[in-house]
Structure formats: C-alpha cells, structure tokens
C-alpha cells in the first residue's frame, strides 16, 4: 500500500477554510451527479467521515475520503473532482496507507456508486464543518 508524504499540521483556521471550500465543492458535485435521472442511492457503499476517537481538526478521515474521490475520478471527469482531491491532499497530515476501493464495473452500479459517495461526501463536509466550528467555540470558552 502507498503512503502519502508527511505534511506539517495546519492551524485549525486553515483547516476550516479548506473544509468550507470542500463543502461548497461537494454541493456542486452532488448537484451535477443528481442530473443523472433514475439512479438510486445504494446501501453497499459507505464513506468514512469523522473519527470519534480524535479531536477536530484531526478527526476527518481525509485519506479514506480522498481514496473514494480518486475512485470516482476514474469513473468521471466532472470538472470539480480534481479540485476536491487537491483540497483533500491539504488535509492529510501524516503517513496514511492508501485505502483500496474496488471500482464498480457495471454501468448502472458506477452511477449508483458515484451518487451514493457524492451524497455521503456532501453530508460529511457539513458534519466536518460543524465539528470544527463547535470545537473552536469550546476552545474559546
């Protein structure tokens, strides 16, 4: 398994800006994905989001999320996906094994995979931002 290069830990306000941008990009991706009619969300795919045993901003499962988005990138070249991956790169602070994700081969299953992960990713960025802002409020009280 590949490991990503070690990066310096970013200040939490930097992380918040990145997550805010990712939240916006995730909405754009989902809006475009939802243009494909007749596709239903699948129960077969789960995007890891926040880790319960870590504090913000280190609680975002960035390496796994990035791996799922890179899998979508193999299936789709919507303009926003490369930008999402670039932002996720900035949230990976230490060596992490690359998550291996099996790519669907069936046409309809590809669509379901992309819709399901895009939806979960959008929800995840909402949760991540809430966790960052609530964490920041607790730190100031």
């Amino acid at each position: 398994s590949h490991t990503l290069p070690v990066r310096l830990l970013r200040p939490s306000d930097d992380v918040q800006k990145i997550v805010e941008e990712l939240q916006s990009l995730s909405k754009m991706l989902l809006k475009d994905v939802e243009e494909e009619k007749g596709v239903l969300v699948s129960q077969n795919y789960t995007l890891p989001c926040l880790s319960p045993d870590a504090q913000p901003p280190n609680n975002i499962h960035s390496p796994a999320i990035r791996a799922y988005l890179k899998t979508i990138r193999q299936l789709d070249n919507k303009s926003v996906i490369d930008e999402i991956i670039e932002h996720l790169d900035k949230l990976i602070f230490q060596d992490a094994p690359e998550t291996n994700i099996s790519v669907p081969t069936d046409t309809h299953e590809c669509k379901r995979f992309i819709l399901t992960i895009s939806q979960q990713f959008s929800e995840c960025m909402d949760l991540a931002l809430k966790s960052l802002t609530s964490g920041a409020q607790q730190a100031t009280t």
Partner: antibody
C-alpha cells in the same frame, strides 16, 4: 435525434475575428458532458482547441497554444456554445468541429457526438 | 506539456491483414482513450471508447486494449471500407492533461 450544428465560418483577413457557434438540438445542456472545439487544417490531423464543462461551473480547458486568442463561452438558454477567435492567422485556416464528450465512463457511447464542421479561411 | 504519440504515421496493408496501431501518452490517462476512424470530408467516427469498449454499430473486427500510458487499436481482418485515417484521443479532462489527439495513422492499400 441529437446533433450539433456549427455555424459562423467564412473568409476573413489576417488579424480579423470570427465567432463560431455550436447549436445543440435533440438534447438540452445538462451536467454530464463537456463541449469542445476541434479543428483540422487541410490535409492535416485533428487538433484540440478548448472544452467547456456543462454543469455547475463553466470550467474551461484550453490547448496551450489557444490561450489568449481563442475564447469559449456558452449560453444555456440557447443551448449553444461559442468560439470567439481573434487575431486570426493564415495557419488558422481549417474546418472547425464542435464535439460533445461525456464526463462519465458510463453510457459513454451515447455521449460522443460530432458536428459536421464549419470552414474558416484566413487569407489576404 | 502532455503528449499523445501515435505510431506508425502511415501503413500499407492488404484486405484480410491484421493491423495494429499504438498510442502512447506522456502520463497516465486512466483508460480515458478513444479511437476514431476518419474519411476525407467527414467528421471522425467513434470506434472505441474507454480504451476497450466497442462503440455501437462498429464491427467486432475492431478492438482496443491498454491501460495507463500505452494503448493499441487492432483491426483483426482489414476490409475494403477500413482504408482511412485513424486517431487516438484522450478526453481525461481536468488535472494537467485535458484533451488531445494523436497525430493520426493513414492506412492505405498495399
């Protein structure tokens, strides 16, 4: 039946400008593809110029040589993509095609669509 | 800058021959590769997409293979209507690659 129809070609003097149009019929602009301009000089190969994404953001990708002189834009209400060409040179003489490409690998076959092309001649 | 190198630039063959054309990308394009056939005065006709998928209505004598940076178009048994120019194209879109065409391979009668 889905088709793309190019127009706006013609003869122009060096240094002049032209605006080409690519009108979509039989389908409406949605978020599952890119529309691109490609050209072919007489007796030469296909040369990619630029693409625009049809979706939440009108992201564009230009061939390095096309940046500056060529500009792509779209009008969703008219289902039309445009190519503005400025400071035209003799070497820009070519047939200009517009083409639609899917953004996803699923159902790709139905997303590859080419127009018949419009001729541009740059000559004094 | 990203490049697609297609070879050979031309070849002469006879009806019934097996013909192979190759296309090499300067960086991985994750199978985002199409092959076209073009005849004079016409727009390109899609033969293969996603490196190996046969477009609808295209005879099964055409096949595509490859991944990463190296791709091949094969015509198993050349027919009279197959004499034309063939192009590879990437439609990866985004990143630092974008779109691009190979230089073309003209297939003529031996």
């Amino acid at each position: 039946q889905s088709q793309l129809v190019e127009s706006g070609g013609g003869s122009v003097q060096p240094g002049g400008s032209l605006r080409l149009s690519c009108a979509a019929s039989g389908f409406s602009f949605s978020a599952n593809y890119w529309i691109c301009w490609v050209r072919q000089a007489p007796g030469k190969g296909l040369e990619w110029i630029v693409c625009i994404y049809i979706g939440s953001r009108a992201d564009t990708y230009y061939a390095p040589w096309a940046k500056g002189r060529f500009t792509i834009s779209k009008d969703n209400s008219k289902n039309t993509v445009y190519l503005q060409m400025n400071s035209l040179r003799a070497e820009d003489t070519a047939t200009y095609f517009c083409a639609r490409f899917s953004s996803g690998i699923y159902d790709l076959d139905r997303f590859f669509l080419w127009g018949q092309g419009t001729q541009v001649t740059v000559s004094s | 800058a990203f490049q697609l190198t297609q070879s050979p630039s031309s070849l002469s063959a006879s009806v019934g021959d097996r013909v192979t054309i190759t296309c090499q990308a300067s960086q991985s394009i994750d199978s985002w590769l199409a092959w076209y056939q073009q005849k004079p005065g016409k727009p390109p006709k899609l033969l293969i997409y996603q490196a190996s998928k046969l477009a609808s209505g295209v005879p099964s004598r055409f096949s595509g293979s490859g991944s990463g940076t190296d791709y091949t178009l094969t015509i198993s048994s050349l027919q009279p209507e197959d004499f034309a120019t063939y192009y590879c194209q990437t439609y990866y879109g985004g990143g630092h690659i974008g779109w691009g065409f190979g230089t073309g391979t003209k297939v003529t009668v031996k």
